[in-house]
């Protein structure tokens, strides 16, 4: 679709005469007749195919028209058209004498008629005018002519439509040649599709507007390159959406079981070795002059009642020192210079020489002990406490200070590790001696009953086209990540233009 | 052939929400070629588009109903849904889901059957 | 808002060409789709992109687009084509039908 223009400039006839040599009267009131069609080699009466155009009277004999003349013509005059150009056309432009009023063909004597021009040719669309001008032996017509597009046509011919657009079927201009030219943030056949932030992941995400980044199911982070770990994940990361992978020291469906106590809490303290011996269980190994579950209790060296016959013991900061009684000497007061003649033996003991009465050795009545029968037994040194118990000494009593898993006077019971439920998802709990053991229902194993071995909900294959299936281990359901180019749940439906006319 | 089909409550009381449902079958309705609307047509008068959807979840509604109306996709059903809450007797009608073709320049090549929501207590 | 016009009715006799106008602010800056309803039924698309025709769409119905009017032509117009007929074009980003023109073949 188009326009043939022709620009009428200047029109002579200084005789003021019609074709047939006849002068007007009183002079040539001249209007125009024009006729476009096709390409004819000899240009011929006949129907004027492209279309016909006439003008009102423009001057008498002589005159110039001007651009957009006055008396209701249009100047250039318009020829449209509604096909594609072709390139080729013969013009006939008529010039008459209007007698009267009226400027119909049938109004006017056939002898009205002042000159006729025909010409034939090329014709390319575009801007530029190009100038001609026709002589005969009584006029002369200067004029111009060029073929446009209408508006929203364009090309060679004018036969490509586009209309500029920018709502959501399009966002786009109009180049020379009538293809697209979308707008920045735009991409696609028509510019509809828009174009993500730049490093948005192109299969985990999408964007509805430019510069967008939208994360597909299982994807977060302002690029969608982050997975998203199992829901409920505490201390454990994911390379592909709901894992749970644990970091160090965690076990467990959701990584929240410590099985490194140690380093999370560092339970020992004054410098002992701590020992993982289970999930929140551990053991602190003490450094020396340290006792305590925690080794958290500082030991006297004096506690172990070094000094014998009677010597008194004094701790030092570098270990202790005994102050032996009269008759005793050495590191421990081990040494006597005494014999049974002193009566070394307290408490009842019996005196007995040894060496030809060099020496001696006193023999103690029940609850009494030491080289000279100075102590009172010490309870704790038949080592009551069974299971690793602490004995402390109490007075006239002693206590076992048990460790964990075990109880009673003497840390002879052992608690039942089943006390605490430890087995998850409805498990049942076995006590044995050296700890406890898990029966899980279906669907799970592990010490615990923690690992979910439920059925794989991806074992069937559910995702298409490549698709990458995972199991979302708290619904037992899956979930599909879609290669480029695919959508919907299972990754079935490709994304792309249609064909165009699916009837 | 594609095919849309509408479906959804008949009867609503005033005030409350009219929700209507269009399955797709015969294609995808996740491709990005298409937007996929809902347009109604009073008893006796003409039609009125409401708004439109994509694959993605891009909305587009009438001004004149923006405040009114919610449509979204279910790329898994291959279903789009319209929910237009306070409804009144003006909003008695027959409604339609479409196809709005990028390629036919938004163009509607297909329609469901349309379905009668009459608005009444 | 944006608004399209019909003339409420068009009559034609049968072989005859009806002309349908829709107009608009600068309708031909927009692409023109025109759809038939017949009583009962859903509507068909007959014209998009201002002039061209859906396959199974006869040659007889035609349209144009340019200026602030936009026209669908039946040529030798028959009596199943008796139906509304509905102008629609795209405001932005808002889908605006025209009021409908009742053809009917005498």
């Known amino acids: 679709s188009g326009v043939f223009q022709l620009q009428l400039q200047e029109f002579i006839n200084e005789r003021g005469v019609l074709a047939s040599g006849r002068p007007c009267e009183p002079g040539c009131r001249t209007f125009f007749r024009v006729c476009l069609k096709h390409f004819q080699a000899v240009v011929s009466p006949g129907p004027c195919t492209f279309g016909t155009v006439s003008t009102p009277v423009l001057g008498t004999n002589s005159f110039a028209v001007r651009d957009d003349s006055s008396g209701g013509g249009r100047n250039p005059l318009q020829l449209p058209f509604n096909f594609t150009w072709p390139g080729t056309f013969s013009l006939i432009i008529e010039a008459w004498h209007a007698p009267g009023d009226d400027l119909r063909p049938e109004a006017l004597p056939p002898d009205a008629l002042i000159s006729k021009i025909a010409i034939q040719g090329s014709l390319a669309v575009g801007q530029n005018w190009l100038l001609d001008e026709q002589t005969s032996t009584l006029t002369r017509l200067r004029y111009s002519y060029r073929v446009i597009c209408s508006d929203n046509y364009y090309g060679d011919n004018c036969s490509r439509l586009c209309k500029k657009r920018n709502d959501h079927f399009g966002h786009y201009v109009c180049q020379p040649d009538g293809n697209l030219s979308c707008l920045p943030g735009w991409t696609g056949e028509y510019c509809q599709q828009p174009i993500c932030l730049s490093g948005c992941h192109e299969q985990n995400g999408y964007c509805s507007k430019p510069a967008e980044c939208l994360c597909r199911p299982g994807w977060q982070g302002r690029l969608c390159n982050e997975c998203i770990p199992h829901n409920g994940c505490r201390h454990g990361t994911c390379s592909t959406p709901w894992q749970c992978t644990c970091d160090e020291g965690w076990g467990g469906l959701f990584c929240d079981q410590d099985l490194n106590y140690c380093t999370h809490h560092s339970p020992c303290k004054n410098g002992a070795t701590c020992s993982n011996s289970g999930q929140r269980s551990y053991t602190c190994t003490c450094r020396p002059g340290y006792t305590g579950v925690d080794c958290e209790l500082e030991l006297s060296e004096c506690d172990s009642n070094p000094c014998r016959n009677g010597g008194s013991c004094k701790d030092q900061e570098d270990g202790y020192h005994c102050l032996c009684p009269p008759g005793y000497y050495g590191l421990h007061c081990e040494h006597s210079t005494l014999s049974c003649a002193d009566s070394p033996c307290f408490n009842g003991g019996s005196c007995r020489e040894r060496n030809q009465g060099a020496n001696y050795a006193c023999e103690c009545p029940p609850n009494f002990t030491g080289s000279n029968c100075e102590k009172k037994v010490d309870r704790c040194t038949s080592n009551p406490c069974a299971n690793g118990g602490q004995c402390l000494n109490r007075g006239p009593s002693r206590m076992c200070r048990c460790r964990p898993g075990f109880t009673g006077t003497y840390c002879e019971l052992h608690v039942s590790d089943c006390a605490r439920n430890p087995c998850a998802h409805g498990g049942t709990c076995h006590d044995l001696e050296n700890g406890l053991m898990c029966t899980c229902p279906a669907g799970f194993s592990g010490r615990r009953c923690e690992v979910r071995t439920s059925i794989d909900a991806c074992a069937s294959s559910p995702c298409f086209n490549r698709a990458t299936c995972y199991t979302d281990l708290s619904t037992d359901t899956f979930v599909c990540n879609c290669p480029y180019g695919f959508v919907g749940s299972r990754c079935e439906f490709p994304v792309g233009l249609p064909p165009s006319f699916p009837w | 052939e594609v095919q849309l089909q509408e479906s959804g409550p008949g009867l609503v009381k005033p005030s409350e929400t009219l929700s209507l449902t269009c399955t797709v079958s015969g294609g995808s309705i996740s491709s990005s070629g298409y937007y996929w609307g809902w347009i109604r047509q009073p008893p006796g008068k003409g039609l009125e588009w409401i708004g439109d959807?994509?694959?993605?979840?891009?909305?587009y509604y009438n001004p004149s109903l923006k405040s009114r109306v919610t449509i979204s996709v279910d790329t898994s059903k291959n279903q789009f849904s319209l929910k237009l809450s306070s409804v009144t007797a003006a909003d008695t009608a027959v409604y339609y889901c479409?196809?709005?073709?990028?390629?036919?320049?938004?163009?509607?090549?297909?329609w469901g059957q349309g379905t009668l929501v009459t608005v009444s207590s | 808002s944006y608004e399209l016009t019909q003339p409420p009715s068009v009559s034609v006799s049968p072989g005859q060409t009806a002309s349908i106008t829709c107009s608009g602010q600068?309708?031909?800056?927009?692409?023109a789709s025109w759809y038939q309803q017949k009583p009962g039924q859903s509507p068909v698309l007959v014209i998009y992109e201002d002039s061209k025709r859906p396959s199974g769409i006869p040659e007889r119905f035609s349209g144009s687009n340019s200026g602030d009017t936009a026209t669908l032509t039946i040529s030798g117009t028959q009596p199943m084509d008796e139906a509304d007929y509905y102008c629609q074009a795209w405001d932005r980003d808002t889908g605006v039908f025209g009021y409908g023109t009742k053809v009917t073949v005498l």
């Open positions: 959807i994509n694959y993605a979840g891009s909305t």
């Open positions: 600068r309708l031909g800056d927009k692409y």
């Open positions: 479409a196809r709005e073709d990028v390629i036919l320049r938004g163009g509607s090549d297909y």
